[in-house]
């Protein structure tokens, strides 16, 4: 097993991305700067800017996107642009989404197979259990915060007037009508896909057909495959397959090395895509603002609901999660967050946890010193099951709808909302048309009207972005916490808990490639700090 890269006082690996996506060395000062530390001399300022260039570009892109969107909206918006020009306007953003989605499948499958194969079953179980516990607790906390805020701020009472303007007949017809049981059965079915290839682009969903049985019209559930990647099924398969590969012992090592190499190549692609991200984000944000009609009117009517959601996300993301991280690691959580600003901005721009996954992996590994076998095992699981933002929004929405329709919420109903929101947000990845359908499930569980889901949909474009940011932040902090847990358990036991599979050279004698051409080779600083020792990179994900 190779030695770990040296870490600075902040516990950060002294490594920086290179052009080919490999890792080069960085001075401790550079790392301090990169992590948001103090930049003193002009030289340090230059290094600081260089280290944070992508982060700064991303932040600028979001701000520029908002400004550009508002500017175009002010000049007439989507109507003035027309469908063709609007399509061209959002194209750079669409391109980023396509690039990221292209990467998801190989990244998730390979990283999870590699990650699961690189951990001994005991460690895998412990790591998985701690991760799921963290995800569950934080989601429950987010739900509680959502309910608490909505009860305190009463967004529904404030927005009651929109009832009149929307019309009495609401739009319950548009609200998905699906049995709660069928939703969870679909979730189970998607965990075990019948066809792995189709799981890459389709998932199972139950719909209903009305049939005439002995003179009575009966609603019969009919299963069908619908468009949309079954990420839950792929995640479960990849983990189980990785464990199976490990069981094979030496026989499976070649295949493990294949998946690890595949993963590294994918990460090289990610490092290239990262530099396009700011451009894409800018146009994604701008495009969404331009597409929206009557943003002002929407804010006037649903302002308190939006405020409630965004405030909840801000409190959970900037106070609750960082506090949990600090309590367990005694490290500065905001330094950690600074390291993942690019994926957070990407999450805001793309509104997709899985699309943000490639960038998040790259950043937590390179900026926050999370080991590959942790990040590449935990992050895909987190992107699938950890949905703090979604749970919080659904709780706010449920209480908002209760207030809007003047329906009471007793203690039992509040607990039901909390539990259902937590459970359904975990399962949302396995349910096609996740967000709205899971909200409908919550409303059904407490007998609240689904008529007003249309109102929630009206501002979903904004709230969902905030949700995604919180979701991916939770995943990243979870990975950071687990890294801390692993560091502590490893320092306590002489025998390392995480057995790692080395990516050895091919069995046939082949010329050793140069570092530039081989992202599997990495240089670490020697003890003296200047001598460079070539070593084989941990091939674990």
């Amino acid at each position: 097993m190779v030695a770990d890269p040296p870490r600075d006082s902040k516990g950060l690996a002294a490594a920086e991305p290179t052009a080919n996506g490999g890792l080069a060395l960085a001075s401790i000062e550079d790392q301090g700067a990169a992590a948001g530390g103090y930049c003193g001399s002009r030289d340090q300022v230059r290094r600081c800017l260089r280290a944070n260039l992508l982060v700064l570009l991303t932040v600028v892109a979001v701000v520029a996107g908002v400004a550009l969107g508002l500017g175009v909206s002010g000049a007439g918006g989507a109507l003035a642009l027309g469908p063709e020009r609007l399509s061209a306007f959002v194209f750079p953003g669409e391109l980023l989404l396509r690039l990221l989605r292209m990467i998801i499948l190989p990244l998730v499958v390979c990283s999870l197979i590699g990650g699961a194969a690189s951990l001994d079953p005991g460690a895998l179980g412990r790591l998985g259990a701690w991760a799921l516990l963290f995800f569950l607790v934080t989601t429950l906390l987010a739900s509680a915060l959502g309910v608490g805020l909505a009860l305190a701020l009463q967004p529904g009472a404030a927005s009651a007037a929109i009832n009149a303007s929307v019309g009495a007949a609401g739009s319950a017809e548009n609200a998905p009508s699906k049995e709660v049981l069928d939703s969870f059965l679909d979730l189970a079915r998607n965990i075990f896909p019948s066809n792995l290839v189709s799981a890459a682009f389709r998932s199972y969903s139950t719909t209903y057909e009305e049939r005439n049985i002995t003179g009575t019209r009966v609603k019969v559930p009919v299963g069908q495959e619908v468009e949309g990647m079954n990420i839950l099924g792929l995640v479960v398969f990849a983990i189980v397959f990785g464990v199976a590969l490990r069981k094979l012992g030496p026989e499976g090592e070649l295949l493990i090395r294949f998946f690890n190499s595949f993963n590294e190549a994918t990460m090289v692609l990610v490092s290239w895509i990262m530099w396009y991200a700011p451009v894409g984000i800018m146009f994604l944000v701008a495009g969404k603002i331009v597409e929206m009609e009557d943003v002002g009117l929407l804010f006037a009517r649903l302002g308190k609901y939006i405020l409630c959601c965004l405030l909840g996300h801000a409190i959970h993301g900037l106070l609750v999660l960082p506090l949990i991280y600090f309590l367990f690691t005694r490290k500065n959580p905001y330094r950690f967050l600074w390291g993942i600003v690019t994926p957070l901005a990407t999450a805001f721009g793309t509104s997709s946890s899985s699309a943000t996954l490639p960038l998040m992996m790259k950043c937590v590994e390179e900026k926050n010193g999370v080991a590959k076998h942790i990040s590449r095992f935990i992050l895909p699981i987190g992107a699938t099951v950890n949905m703090d933002g979604a749970a919080l929004f659904q709780c706010v929405a449920a209480v908002f709808i209760a207030q809007l329709s003047q329906q009471s919420l007793d203690f039992v109903k509040i607990i039901t909302i909390l539990v259902t929101a937590t459970a359904s947000s975990v399962g949302a990845a396995g349910i096609p048309a996740g967000g709205v359908l899971t909200l409908a499930i919550i409303l059904e569980a407490v007998n609240l009207p689904v008529d007003h889901i249309s109102l929630i949909l009206a501002v979903d474009w904004l709230v969902d972005r905030s949700c995604t940011v919180l979701n991916v932040e939770g995943d990243a902090l979870g990975a950071g916490l687990l890294q801390n847990y692993v560091d502590r358990t490893e320092s306590r036991s002489t025998e390392p808990e995480l057995i790692q599979v080395k990516s050895e050279l091919p069995l046939d004698p082949l010329p050793v490639p140069t570092e530039e051409g081989n992202p599997l080779l990495k240089h670490y600083r020697g003890p003296a700090g200047d001598a460079t020792v070539a070593s084989e990179k941990e091939s674990v994900m």
């Epitope: 009472a157 009149a164 319950a172 009508s177 809007l404 003047q406 007998n447 009207p449």
Partner: antibody, heavy 120, light 107 residues
Framework: QIQLVQSGPELKKPGETVKISCKAS????????MSWVKQVPGKGLKWMGW????????IYGDDFKGRFAFSLETSASTAYLQINNVKNEDTATYFC?????????????WGQGTTLTVSS | DIQMTQTTSSLSASLGDRVTISCRAS??????LNWYQRKPHGTVKLLIY???RLHSGVPSRFSGSGSGTDYSLTISNLEQEDIATYFC?????????FGGGTKLEIK
Amino acid sequence: QIQLVQSGPELKKPGETVKISCKASGYTFTTFGMSWVKQVPGKGLKWMGWIHTYAGVPIYGDDFKGRFAFSLETSASTAYLQINNVKNEDTATYFCARRSDNYRYFFDYWGQGTTLTVSS
Amino acid sequence: DIQMTQTTSSLSASLGDRVTISCRASQDIRNYLNWYQRKPHGTVKLLIYYTSRLHSGVPSRFSGSGSGTDYSLTISNLEQEDIATYFCQQGHTLPPTFGGGTKLEIK
């Protein structure tokens, strides 16, 4: 006990305005929405809309937008239905009904009804 | 809007009989079906909500059942005071809609 007491019968000429009151007692007025239901003689019941008693916001059914107005006097625990420019087809019995705060849309307590007759 | 149909507009029964009044919705109303009683020139009373839940103060001889689009109200032991018109109402989505009513008479 919970009671909804409506004002007496009304006889109006077309074009006039009528205001029907519904006084609630026995519960916290602002906790439950108040609905209005119309019954034309020999016909079924038709939901007119409801008023959010906490926010004071009226919500009207599609057939009752324009001439109809719901209002409240919270301090007196009273809801009002006003019909402007009454027409012959407004001849009916109007009920106020407390909207339950559970199980979506149903009405657990009803007023005795106010008969409106529109005749020239 | 969801249409509610009570196929039987009037029904004759003897005291002590078991009477069933049916109601059909134009689409699945997921058990959000309520029953009301209106006595001649009297007030309207809620009998049953959410398909089968008895409202407070309603005698236990009244019961409700059904699912999807088909629902029914049953009076197990008809009494003189039960002579009235019975309305069903869906509370699944706005606007709430009522059936045309079933008038119950004594044979």
